[in-house]
């Protein structure tokens, strides 16, 4: 059998909303996927587990089931939704995201998905895990790719 | 209903001290971020002082750094300005703002406690 | 620190008619994100004053959509296409974009 390449493409969108009670942050974070079939049959995508870290804690996870085949030689992207929750225990963070005297809320999040495929029977994980840009101040749509985080560095607010 | 209700405005001789209050309620105080305005005598509108909603964050312009604080306490619904050093160019009204982080400003004032400096 | 003009009197405008206030900034309130941080506030008489616009051309909650707002990066125009009694007062532009926040001298508007 060929590979089967999964790529992480960056996150397609991020909408924010508040609850001021709890002074807590939501997060529903699109992110997209490519995933190439490179064999001479098809392949069945049976699920995609993801999760999102801020600060090595695990605001939110996702599960997709029995999402797609990809036929041969083929290539498809996926997108898939990760509700995160920035809670209380990170009060500053409230603070921040709601800041009006910052224009940009950019936070740095660790994305983790791992792609399970079948085919004839066989099982195959694939995982990547990359970090990225998230405003969390406002919804924001992003080119792919637009929100990746290159720089070693904490960054700049 | 968003209600400010700010008080503690007096007539203060210059280099004298005063401290201002504004009581919220309405909504939730410990969720916004509040602000400072004063309307001086020639109605200019002046932006003194901003507090995060969990006092994170704090700003004041180059011309009250040092010598006003601004503080809260969330569990008493209130706002604080603390002034010092006072000079006559602070005779103003003081209004105490909510900050809303949809519009990016401040959407409600109070009704504004009066300093007077002077000797 | 980026100033806000504004002349201190309108055009003396008839009830019923349309009015124009306008402002202008030292500096593009253009941010990169796409949002223009410049704000519009009315302070009728004897009164605080009251969020008309956010982010140049959004109404506030509760404001009357006979209020509206355009402009580029520093030049602003707040019109009001009906005017009533219930609009005098004097009317401020603000921007925050960069501390320190500031606000125009406002201006007047002023019935005929």
């Known amino acids: 059998p060929r590979s089967i390449d999964v790529k992480y493409i960056g996150v397609k969108s991020a909408y924010v909303s508040y609850d001021v009670q709890k002074r807590t942050i939501y997060l529903n974070i699109t992110n997209t996927l490519n995933i190439t079939n490179n064999n001479y049959y098809s392949v069945e995508v049976e699920n995609i587990t993801a999760q999102v870290q801020f600060a090595k804690t695990v605001i939110g996870k996702a599960r997709l089931n029995n999402i797609t085949h990809i036929g041969p030689l083929d290539m498809k992207q996926i997108d898939y939704t990760v509700p995160t929750v920035i809670a209380e225990e990170m009060s500053y963070m409230y603070d921040f995201c709601t800041l009006i005297s910052i224009k940009v809320h950019n936070i740095v999040l660790m994305m983790q998905v791992t792609v399970t495929t079948t085919y004839f029977g066989h099982s195959e994980q694939i995982s990547q895990e990359r970090y990225q840009y998230v405003d969390c101040g406002r919804n924001t749509t992003y080119q792919l790719g637009q929100s990746e985080y290159l720089n070693v560095l904490q960054p700049q607010q | 209903e968003v209600q400010l209700v700010e008080s503690g405005g007096d007539l203060v001789k210059p280099g004298g001290s005063l401290k201002l209050s504004c009581v919220a309620s309405?909504?939730?105080?410990?969720?916004?971020?509040m602000s400072w305005v004063r309307q001086t005598p020639d109605k200019r509108l002046e932006w003194v002082a901003t507090i995060s909603s969990g006092s994170f964050y704090i700003y004041y312009p180059d011309s009250v750094k040092g010598r006003l604080t601004v503080s809260r306490d969330n569990a008493k619904n209130t706002l604080y300005l603390q002034m010092s050093s006072l000079k006559s160019e602070d005779t103003a009204i003081y209004y105490c703002a909510r900050q809303n982080f949809y519009y990016g400003c401040e959407d409600y004032w109070g009704q504004g406690t009066t300093l007077t400096v002077s000797s | 620190d980026i100033v806000m003009t504004q002349a201190a009197f309108s055009n003396p405008v008839t009830l019923g008619t349309s009015a124009s206030i306008s402002c202008r900034s030292s500096?593009?309130?253009?941010?990169?994100?796409?949002?223009?941080?410049l704000y519009w506030y009315l302070q009728k008489p004897g009164q605080s004053p009251q969020l008309l616009i956010y982010?140049?051309?959004n109404l506030a909650s509760g404001v009357p959509n006979r209020f509206s707002s355009s402009g580029s990066g520093t030049d602003f125009t707040l019109r009001i296409s009906r005017v009533e009694a219930e609009d005098v007062g004097v009317y401020y532009c603000a921007q925050n974009l960069e501390l320190p926040w500031t606000f125009g001298g406002g201006t007047k508007l002023e019935i005929k």
């Open positions: 982010q140049m051309s």
């Open positions: 500096k593009s309130l253009l941010h990169s994100n796409g949002i223009t941080y």
């Open positions: 309405g909504f939730t105080f410990s969720g916004y971020g």
